[in-house]
Structure formats: C-alpha cells, structure tokens
Interface confidence: low
C-alpha cells in the first residue's frame, strides 16, 4: 500500500538568466528511495540513483546542477524553460511517486516588478 506523499516547491516564477532550485520531498512512508528522476515534460533532465549517484542528461549538463539533496538546480534560465517539471521517486517496496512543479521564467523587467505565476 502506497502511503507516502510528495511535497514540492509548487508553482515558481524566476527571472530570465537566473537560477532556481527545484525541490521535492517524499514523506509519510518508510519505503527506500532507490532512484529519483527529474523530467521536464517528456525530457529526462537528471537521475539520482542511490547506488550510482547523479547523472545529468548531456543536453542539459551546462545548465543543470545536482542538488541540494535530491533537488535540482537550473541555471541560466531562458523563457523556453517555462513549463512543467516532475520529480519521480522510485521506491521499494511502494513503487513510484510523482511530484509536479510549474516554472514560469519571466523577462527581467517583468520579474523586477514582483509579478509571479499563479494557477487560478
């Protein structure tokens, strides 16, 4: 029975050219985390394997940094980075848990005035 829950940083807005941390946390389960995948829509960004450590997809290695913890740091953000990000926790014996984060990257002039993305 899957009893765990994923907490995420929710909906984030960030400034073009800046950096952001994507963070998920699995709680309420004693299941062992064997691997965490980070994906953007249908693209694999990174894998953190309990035994093998981190692997960053080659197409993202210049802008993605592992951590903090099981999170992911995105650097040199562009407007094209706007979209859904998923943390996929592979656990034993529970199975797979998925968390969702929505990132909107704002042009500098917009971000400086404090606008941020919200889902109605």
């Amino acid at each position: 029975m899957m009893t765990g829950t994923i907490e995420t940083t929710g909906n984030i807005s960030a400034e073009k050219g800046g950096s952001i941390i994507l963070q998920c946390h699995l709680s309420s389960t004693t299941a062992q985390v064997t691997q965490v995948n980070w994906e953007q829509q249908d693209q694999l960004l990174a894998i953190c394997n309990a035994d093998l450590g981190w692997h960053i997809s080659p197409s993202f290695k210049d802008r993605v940094a592992p951590g903090p913890g099981l999170g992911l740091t995105l650097q040199s953000l562009t407007v094209n980075d706007t979209g859904e990000y998923f943390c996929i926790y592979h656990t034993y014996p529970d199975g797979t848990y998925t968390g969702r984060i929505f990132l909107e990257v704002l042009e500098s002039s917009v971000a400086e005035h404090g606008a941020r993305f919200q889902i109605p």
Epitope: T9, I12, S13, A14, E15, S19, A111, G114, R116
Partner: nanobody
C-alpha cells in the same frame, strides 16, 4: 520592493574564516527560503547553501562540513559562516531568495560580495 544586500566579503588567507551576511528588506527571511550561490571568474554561478523557512539546510558537496548557513529572524538576515577556506572558494558570493514562500531559490538576487582566498 524586495532587496537583498550582502556584506562580509574580503581577503582571507587559506584556512581562515569569514562570515557573509544577507540583509533582506521588504520581506521576512523566516517565511522564505534563502540561499547562497557563488561565481568564480570564468565559471558558471553555482549553488553553495540554502536554508528553508522550516529551518532545513542544504549544502553543495564542495562546502559540506566547512560552511554553515543560518538565519536570524529578528534581524531579517541570513548568514554564511565559511571556515577552512581554500583558494578555490574565491568567488563573488550572491544571496538569493524567492518571490513567494512556496517557491525555490534564485529569482531575487543581491549584488554580490567578493571573497578572495589567497596567501
């Protein structure tokens, strides 16, 4: 308007210590994640440490055991205590925060403070 102002940088010998401060105006540090990034000459800006509103702390592997991040809610200031400094710690250190209490780091930046580790 939210502003982050760093201070405490300077020249220090290898093995020495420094404490960086990040004063936040227009917001309370207790309700937002705060963090530090750094950028060495010719390199990308990299994550150093973060502290969440619940007090959880995160560190880059390269600084674990040497750097400590903390926050003083009464002074609305975050700190980075840096011990056992190495020449490779030389960089401009930036304080980072967020627009909302639910977001990650890095959409509000300070102007940076230079740390130089050299004998």
């Amino acid at each position: 308007e939210v502003q982050l102002v760093e201070s405490g940088g300077g020249l220090v010998q290898p093995g020495g210590s420094l404490r960086l401060s990040c004063a936040a105006s227009g917001r309370t540090v207790s309700s937002h994640a705060m963090g530090w990034f750094r950028q060495a000459p010719g390199k990308e800006r990299e994550f150093v440490a973060a502290i969440t509103s619940s007090g959880s702390t995160y560190y880059a592997d390269s600084v674990k055991g040497r750097f400590t991040i903390s926050a003083d809610n009464s002074k609305n200031t975050a700190y980075l205590q840096m011990n056992s400094l190495k020449p490779e710690d030389t960089a401009v250190y930036y304080c980072a925060s967020s627009y909302s209490s639910s977001s990650g780091l890095g959409d509000i930046w300070g102007q940076g403070t230079l740390v130089t580790v050299s004998s």
